[in-house]
């Protein structure tokens, strides 16, 4: 806390400019009018204030706006944003995407800080849903943003926003998140033709059910092994050798390299060795010839 001291004669700030960098902390406190600071916030960024001086400027704004800063000030905070605490940010009402972009720019290249997380949370809650423009902006700054949301939060993403999602935005998503995103993507891309549809839906397939994988296997999509390995094990298990062969196309030979990884390993264990042998890949571990396969899950469902 800076002590209240009178401003020395002739030092009263008429505007926010470079001369202020020579002011001591107490002089800044005494000689800079908070209302002037608020109206000229856009100038602060261009002036090489020390961290201590920025603390004083923040203190002045806090005094002027104890209930939270108005958006006109927030938009021009620049590096002063890095001084804000999540508690400060919770008082704000940020509605403009331009304001959000301006503040994300300040933190660009860094991990998502608690301040940024709070800002995004306030912004999205204020909008009511994660619309396409917001998602575009957030994933541009933080490719992993989408995967940081809970399945519940993801449920508020409208299908139209899915168009903004790039494959790298889904890299860190877990199966629960893809379970929520996949049906939205399916809806978003439903009017595309076969090959274009596959290119768009491919990144979301970790949430696809067996029926959809069977349907894809009829469309000559040539799924690569990296995508296949991300599929839900329970969705892959019911696929036949012929269906997997059609689904993977020329990539089918890649099964050998992944035969000990899930879901390939579990799928192999469910296939007849005879059927696996037709692939000519040397896959081992299938059900030996002559063995009867009982589907106990079906039996349980009936009883």
């Amino acid at each position: 806390e800076v002590e209240k001291t009178a401003c020395p004669s002739g030092k009263k700030a008429r505007e926010i400019d470079e001369s202020l960098i020579f002011y001591k902390k107490w002089e800044l406190e005494a000689c800079v009018d908070a209302a002037l600071l608020a109206t000229q916030m856009d100038r602060v960024n261009a002036i090489p204030f020390t961290y201590e001086q920025l603390d004083v400027l923040k203190h002045k704004l806090d005094e002027l706006y104890p209930q939270g800063y108005p958006e006109s000030v927030i938009q021009h905070l620049g590096y002063l944003f890095l001084k804000m605490s999540p508690e400060d940010i919770r008082k704000w009402n940020v509605t403009s995407l331009e304001t959000l972009k301006a503040l994300l720019e300040v933190n660009k290249g860094h991990e998502m800080s608690p301040q940024v997380a709070t800002l995004i949370d306030r912004f999205v809650k204020g909008r009511g849903q994660l619309d396409k423009d917001t998602l575009d902006t957030l994933t541009a700054f933080y490719p992993g943003y989408l995967c940081s949301l809970s399945p519940e939060e993801l449920s508020s993403v409208p299908p139209s926003s899915i168009w903004a999602v790039r494959p790298q935005d889904l890299d860190t998503c877990d199966p629960r998140q893809l379970d929520v995103l996949y049906p939205k993507a399916r809806l978003a891309f439903q009017n595309m033709n076969g090959s274009e549809y596959f290119v768009k839906i491919q990144s979301f397939l970790g949430g696809a059910p067996t029926e959809d994988l069977k349907a894809l296997s009829q469309q000559n999509v040539s799924m690569d092994l990296a995508t296949f390995m991300k599929l839900r094990t329970d969705a892959v298990l019911p696929l036949t050798v012929a269906e997997v062969q059609k689904l993977l196309g020329p990539h089918v030979e890649g099964l050998k390299a992944e035969e000990r990884h899930r879901p390939v390993r579990d799928w192999i264990l469910r296939q007849r060795q005879d059927d696996l042998d037709t692939l000519g890949l040397g896959l081992q571990g299938g059900i030996p010839n002559g063995y009867l396969v009982l589907d106990l899950s079906m039996q349980e469902a009936l009883s």
Partner: antibody, heavy 119, light 108 residues
């Protein structure tokens, strides 16, 4: 440019553990498995196991089962290989090597990390 | 596990000479699942040939690979000074993946 950058040399006492890191850059991290291969002084290459960075699934060579743990951190595109209960025979250069998912050959290798186990 | 035996262990060759390295497997290896690596002193291994005969990116055409079943061959058609290295065959046809013991090629 595709690069695998490994952590620096380590000297450990018998019975201790060592954790070697391998940071990937210049490609889509989740499209490639990361394998670990070691080479004892003046010896050949020995495959230790692999990790699928997308799923976190691991496969270990039976010889190292129970002593080796491979993990990944997608947020930093880094994989780790930890070897426990070290003995003098574990003195070697440890390499991480990239392997495209669906293939079995290693197209890019890290620079290697020398681990010396000595009392 | 499949044991890969390379021969010879060591070869001293004059430049422009042809070099042949063999890799013999203790049981059959599907040819798509065999590769060769080159390792120069104090360097990491480098992929040379994959799927028995496919040249990796940037590898000179004087290198070639062939073979099937249990017998595979790496050939350097006209040896150059920069080819001084140890060469390893590697199989991923059967678990665990294994490497040959290596063949050291020295320039005379």
């Amino acid at each position: 440019e595709v690069q695998l950058v490994q952590s620096g040399a380590e000297v450990k006492k018998p019975g201790a553990s060592v954790k070697v890191s391998c940071k990937a850059s210049g490609y889509t991290f989740t499209d490639y498995n990361m394998d670990w291969v070691r080479q004892a002084p003046g010896q050949g290459l020995e495959w230790m196991g692999d990790i699928n960075p997308s799923t976190g699934g691991t496969i270990y060579n039976q010889k190292f089962q129970g002593r080796v743990t491979m993990t990944e951190d997608k947020s930093t595109s880094t994989v780790y290989m930890e070897l426990s209960s070290l003995r003098s025979e574990d003195t070697a250069v440890y390499y991480c090597a990239r392997r495209r998912i669906g293939t079995g050959y290693f197209d890019v290798w890290g620079q290697g990390t020398t681990v010396t186990v000595s009392s | 596990e499949i044991v890969l035996t390379q021969s010879p262990d060591f070869q001293s060759v004059t430049p422009k000479e042809k070099v042949t390295i063999t890799c013999s497997a203790s049981s059959s290896v599907i040819s798509s699942y065999l590769s060769w690596y080159q390792q120069k002193p104090d360097q990491s291994p480098k992929l040379l040939i994959y799927r028995t005969s496919n040249l990796a990116s940037g590898v000179p055409s004087r290198f070639s690979g062939s073979g099937s079943g249990t017998d595979f061959t790496l050939t350097i058609n006209s040896l150059e000074a920069e080819d001084a290295a140890t060469y390893y065959c590697h199989q991923w046809s059967s678990f665990p993946y294994t490497f040959g013991g290596g063949t050291k090629v020295e320039i005379k």
